[in-house]
Amino acid sequence: APVLPGEDSKDVAAPHSQPLTSSERIDKHIRYILDGISALRKETCNRSNMCESSKEALAENNLNLPKMAEKDGCFQSGFNEDTCLVKIITGLLEFEVYLEYLQNRFESSEEQARAVQMSTKVLIQFLQKKAKNLDAITTPEPTTNASLLTKLQAQNQWLQDMTTHLILRSFKEFLQSSLRALRQM
């Protein structure tokens, strides 16, 4: 199995500790991505006042960011492992275009933005191996993604800053819900 970002040799064979289970490895990996998002959010919030803005709803209407809902089977009430895993993988695949959009949005955290994107790709591969029902996973159309990317990049500066803030916040929330759900599997 590939060594995930955020892991190092001491995680694999630290003295006096057990080797990480598959569940713990995925968990650690998601936390690595979340730490990256925190760093990116820090730069975004320092750079603009978007983090305090009350105009989020205005920009959010133009985005179709994946969200976790009760029907997805990821919450404790009505938990369904197969349905939930499909939702997590589908959601991560849908986030990929937004993570691509983030790539040119950072100055001091450019490498961090790339790490979040690459780590998410690895996470998707890991989860796809875990999924039994791969047929139910819908992959976004490349042409749709390309036109969405063009549209996002054509926004004015204020909207681009708001979009960056919303993507980071939504991705963080989606990963946190995924983390909790995966711990139930």
């Epitope: 713990e24 919450f75 404790q76 009430s77 929330e173 711990r183």
Partner: antibody, heavy 120, light 106 residues
Framework: EVQLVESGGGLVQPGGSLRLSCAAS????????MIWVRQAPGKGLEWVSD????????YYADSVKGRFTMSRDISKNTVYLQMNSLRAEDTAVYYC?????????????WGRGTLVTVSS | DIQMTQSPSTLSASVGDRVTITCRAS??????LAWYQQKPGKAPKVLIY???TLESGVPSRFSGSGSGTEFTLTISSLQPDDFATYYC????????FGQGTKLEIK
């Protein structure tokens, strides 16, 4: 001042219901994970439920699942614990608390607790 | 629920002693474990989180170790203020506690 204040405790008969409230001040519950913990007289701490701020996802201990419901009112910055079908073993001081950060790892803020007594 | 088993339930020791409390989880919880100290009539106070990170302001005589399912809290040299009840809590899923260890004066 950052604090949590619980209310709503009292004496209730077995099979009865009670709703506990937890008013937060100095921070917003909409961006924090909240938790209820109870402690029976002379006994240890028992986790009851928690509420993840995102999507209001709740999680319950097996001992209360199906009987207790944790919810929130963001406009009032208040968390609730609706307790139904109460039993004698639910008698305890109920603490409202806050998970410390985005990756819940420890409880960093506790209320003073409210006593719930279930007795006939 | 994840079950947390703490031992011993009571521990008698003297000032200056080195004491160790153990906590075992019913399933792997990585490093998602915290240790608390509670005194009568008071809310618990966190000592250690993420298995081994010392909370700021907590004396360095307290230390935590372990990962997966086995964890320990060590007090290197007991002080009079340390006589209290100690709890472990997992935060992998939910937040179940160990049953507590009462540390009393021998």
């Amino acid at each position: 001042e950052v604090q949590l204040v619980e209310s709503g405790g009292g004496l209730v008969q077995p099979g009865g219901s009670l709703r506990l409230s937890c008013a937060a001040s100095g921070f917003t519950i909409s961006s924090n994970y909240m938790i209820w913990v109870r402690q029976a007289p002379g006994k240890g701490l028992e986790w009851v439920s928690d509420l993840y701020y995102y999507a209001g996802d709740t999680y319950y201990a097996d001992s209360v699942k199906g009987r207790f419901t944790m919810s929130r009112d963001i406009s009032k910055n208040t968390v609730y614990l609706q307790m139904n079908s109460l039993r004698a073993e639910d008698t305890a001081v109920y603490y409202c608390a806050r998970w410390a950060d985005d990756h819940p790892a420890w409880v960093d803020l506790w209320g003073r607790g409210t006593l719930v007594t279930v007795s006939s | 629920d994840i079950q947390m088993t703490q031992s011993p339930s009571t521990l008698s020791a003297s000032v200056g002693d080195r004491v160790t409390i153990t906590c075992r989880a019913s399933q792997g919880i990585s490093s998602w474990l915290a240790w608390y100290q509670q005194k009568p009539g008071k809310a618990p106070k966190v000592l250690i989180y993420k298995a081994s990170t010392l909370e700021s302001g907590v004396p360095s005589r307290f230390s935590g170790s372990g990962s997966g399912t086995e964890f320990t809290l060590t007090i290197s040299s007991l002080q009079p203020d340390d006589f209290a009840t100690y709890y472990c809590q997992q935060s992998w899923l939910g937040g179940s506690f160990g049953q507590g260890t009462k540390l009393e004066i021998k």
